[in-house]
């Protein structure tokens, strides 16, 4: 349905508040280094222009595409060349190449200062003094650090952020009320960002077909009572929403997401019995709730899959007539029966099935050829099951911190060329799979663990893509989306790696470590552990444990010393010497 003015259409659909918020997010995700005030100025200019188009859709420039309008606005930034370098060259291009160019320059790891949380009283004063600016600043700071954050979901986070301050700044103990809420929003926000980053990577690196396959599997698990046609419609709509958001079309994305939520709620009866509560909520909460809704119960007495997909004489005929539809039906039928499988496992099974049909439907006796296809699934199912069992046992034995350390060592030995901060961040997140998933019963462990690992390994892939240093990482990241985790799991110690030169400075610590939070102190220790492995990749677990124990004792002792700095200097020298001796250097 073509509109004379796209900008007027979106302004009317979304309302001024959401329009302004989404334009701010879009601009901050593109120009990540620009000051807040500059972005607010640009957003106000766009908003004023949109209002003129609402008043008269035939007014000058109102017929231009949103990319043209927004791109033109971004290209007015005076310091574009100095701040962004070659990104300024995007402005010489025409749409749609200009927008593609901006997208390619999004930085997953922008050089921005860590967000330091001010004192509660300072935050409450700022909130009361100018609520609108305070909330815009939140959107800006999150969007520029997470350039693929799912924009309509960020509006939901901002709503919760506002609610937290509204409630807690009036509380008797502001800090006790506010800080846990902010911690929760921060942790959920990081998780939400990483999940969306995988969706965008899936679309951008592997194409729409890969994303649709993922969506068929996930929605079929979630809505096992829905018909295939219903699931297919939802998949098509969801793909459009995420394609738009990942492409920077945030106004269209938010609008289409609202339409999808509306459709789902109007058709609950044919989708899922679990949607009732979600559908009673306001728009932002509703969309979030639907996205997180638990799996519906599986229909009783579902027939065996073998009848339609192995035993039927029409398998090759049905496959040949409409390959993707037939494979989609296979994936739908398998997924709705297996909420206990990870989505990536379901996709591996579908890929195996597809490969078998491709081979067998060209054979002399197709049925004879594909008759045992389900037997090929067994090892594919057992591999993640065994891996999760082993790692949950290790997690239960070690606890989260030491489990993270085991993974740090494992992954540093696999891909020692990767930067230390990336190895620490990724391994810490991999290690969180333990507390996140190992508590679940068997039936929920695999979807929790393996799909979470896919999200974390995608972080490694996008960070590595910015500065590629390891062919092995590139290979695992690019060959197959669904086999990324098995690819990394299969990597052994990199025998080609030349150990890093020993640098005492890397292992020099100061009294400032004593004032760090427990988390920051862990990160310091884990950074040292990665550097140790890079320095001595053949070190045994026992050797590394001895050195890390020494390091922990060193920090504990010096942080209790009267003259901390002297202790760190003197004991530090001895720690380095003791470590070198322990590692046989």
């Amino acid at each position: 349905d073509a509109h004379k003015s796209e900008v007027a259409h979106r302004f009317k659909d979304l309302g001024e508040e959401n329009f302004k918020a989404l334009v701010l997010i879009a601009f901050a995700q593109y120009l990540q280094q620009c000051p807040f005030e500059d972005h607010v100025k640009l957003v106000n200019e766009v908003t004023e222009f949109a209002k003129t188009c609402v008043a008269d859709e035939s007014a000058e420039n109102c017929d231009k595409s949103l990319h043209t309008l927004f791109g033109d606005k971004l290209c007015t930034v005076a310091t574009l060349r100095e701040t962004y370098g070659e990104m300024a060259d995007c402005c010489a291009k025409q749409e749609p190449e200009r927008n593609e160019c901006f997208l390619q320059h999004k930085d997953d790891n922008p050089n921005l200062p860590r967000l330091v949380r001010p004192e509660v009283d300072v935050m409450c004063t700022a909130f009361h003094d100018n609520e609108e600016t305070f909330l815009k600043k939140y959107l800006y700071e999150i969007a520029r650090r997470h350039p693929y954050f799912y924009a309509p979901e960020l509006l939901f986070f901002a709503k919760r952020y506002k609610a937290a301050f509204t409630e807690c700044c009036q509380a008797a103990d502001k800090a006790a009320c506010l800080l846990p809420k902010l911690d929760e929003l921060r942790d959920e926000g990081k998780a939400s960002s990483a999940k969306q980053r995988l969706k965008c990577a899936s679309l951008q690196k592997f194409g729409e077909r890969a994303f649709k396959a993922w969506a068929v599997a996930r929605l079929s698990q979630r809505f096992p009572k829905a018909e295939f046609a219903e699931v297919s419609k939802l998949v098509t709509d969801l793909t459009k929403v995420h394609t738009e958001c990942c492409h920077g079309d945030l106004l269209e994305c938010a609008d289409d997401r609202a339409d999808l939520a509306k459709y789902i709620c109007e058709n609950q009866d044919s989708i899922s019995s679990k949607l009732k509560e979600c559908c009673e909520k306001p728009l932002l909460e509703k969309s979030h709730c639907i996205a997180e809704v638990e799996n519906d119960e599986m229909p009783a007495d579902l027939p065996s899959l073998a009848a339609d997909f192995v035993e039927s004489k029409d398998v090759c005929k049905n496959y040949a007539e409409a390959k993707d539809v037939f494979l989609g039906m296979f994936l739908y039928e398998y997924a709705r029966r297996h909420p206990d499988y990870s989505v990536v496992l379901l996709l591996r099974l579908a890929k195996t099935y597809e490969t078998t049909l491709e081979k067998c439907c060209a054979a002399a006796d197709p049925h004879e050829c594909y008759a045992k296809v389900f037997d090929e699934f067994k090892p594919l199912v057992e591999e993640p099951q065994n891996l999760i069992k082993q790692n949950c046992e290790l997690f239960e034995q070690l606890g989260e911190y030491k489990f993270q350390n085991a993974l740090l060592v494992r992954y540093t030995k696999k891909v020692p060329q990767v930067s230390t901060p990336t190895l620490v961040e990724v391994s810490r997140n991999l290690g969180k799979v333990g507390s996140k998933c190992c508590k679940h019963p068997e039936a929920k462990r695999m979807p929790c663990a393996e799909d979470y690992l896919s999200v974390v390994l995608n972080q490694l892939c996008v960070l590595h893509e910015k500065t590629p240093v390891s062919d092995r990482v590139t290979k695992c990241c690019t060959e197959s989306l669904v086999n990324r985790r098995p690819c990394f799991s299969a990597l052994e110690v990199d025998e080609t790696y030349v150990p890093k030169e020993f640098n005492a400075e890397t292992f020099t610590f100061h009294a400032d470590i004593c004032t760090l939070s427990e988390k920051e102190r862990q990160i310091k220790k884990q950074t040292a552990l990665v550097e140790l492995v890079k320095h001595k990749p053949k070190a045994t677990k026992e050797q590394l444990k001895a050195v890390m124990d020494d390091f922990a004792a060193f920090v504990e002792k010096c942080c209790k010393a009267d003259d901390k700095e002297t202790c760190f200097a003197e004991e530090g020298k001895k720690l380095v010497a003791a470590s070198q001796a322990a590692l046989g250097l």
Epitope: A546, D550, E571, K574, A578, A581
Partner: nanobody
Framework: EVQLVESGGGLVQPGRSLRSCAAS????????MHWVRQAPGKGLEWVSG????????TYADSVKGRFTISRDNAKNSLYLQMNSLRAEDTALYYC????????????????WGRGTLVTVSS
């Protein structure tokens, strides 16, 4: 205040004997510990050292294979098991705290006990 109190001295037959040292007034597991001895009319001789958690242990050549140093951080105690004792092992045995957690380079003896006399006699 730092206190190191040795026990297990006296007249011993050639064979085996255990010295122990009770530590107090400081965080025991923050320090390496040593045994140092002084034979009658002779200078001080370092015998053995043990790092903060017992991972690194060193011995003087004169006692290697015969003496075993150990520690129990939960009990704030240091031990020296002496086997195959000889007359030349007769000495005043001191329990000594290092300044460091680690056994690397030359030891830095920071606090001494009063010593316990071991006399080996057949």
């Amino acid at each position: 205040e730092v206190q190191l109190v040795e026990s297990g001295g006296g007249l011993v037959q050639p064979g085996r004997s255990l010295r122990s040292c009770a530590a107090s007034g400081f965080t025991f597991h923050h320090y390496a510990m040593h045994w140092v001895r002084q034979a009658p009319g002779k200078g001080l001789e370092w015998v053995s050292g043990i790092s903060w958690n017992g991972n690194k242990i060193t011995y003087a050549d004169s006692v290697k294979g015969r003496f075993t140093i150990s520690r129990d951080n939960a009990k704030n105690s240091l031990y020296l098991q002496m086997n195959s004792l000889r007359a030349e092992d007769t000495a005043l045995y001191y329990c000594v705290r290092d300044s460091s957690l680690f056994i690397v380079g030359a030891p830095t003896f920071e606090h001494w006990g009063r010593g316990t006399l071991v006399t080996v006699s057949s």
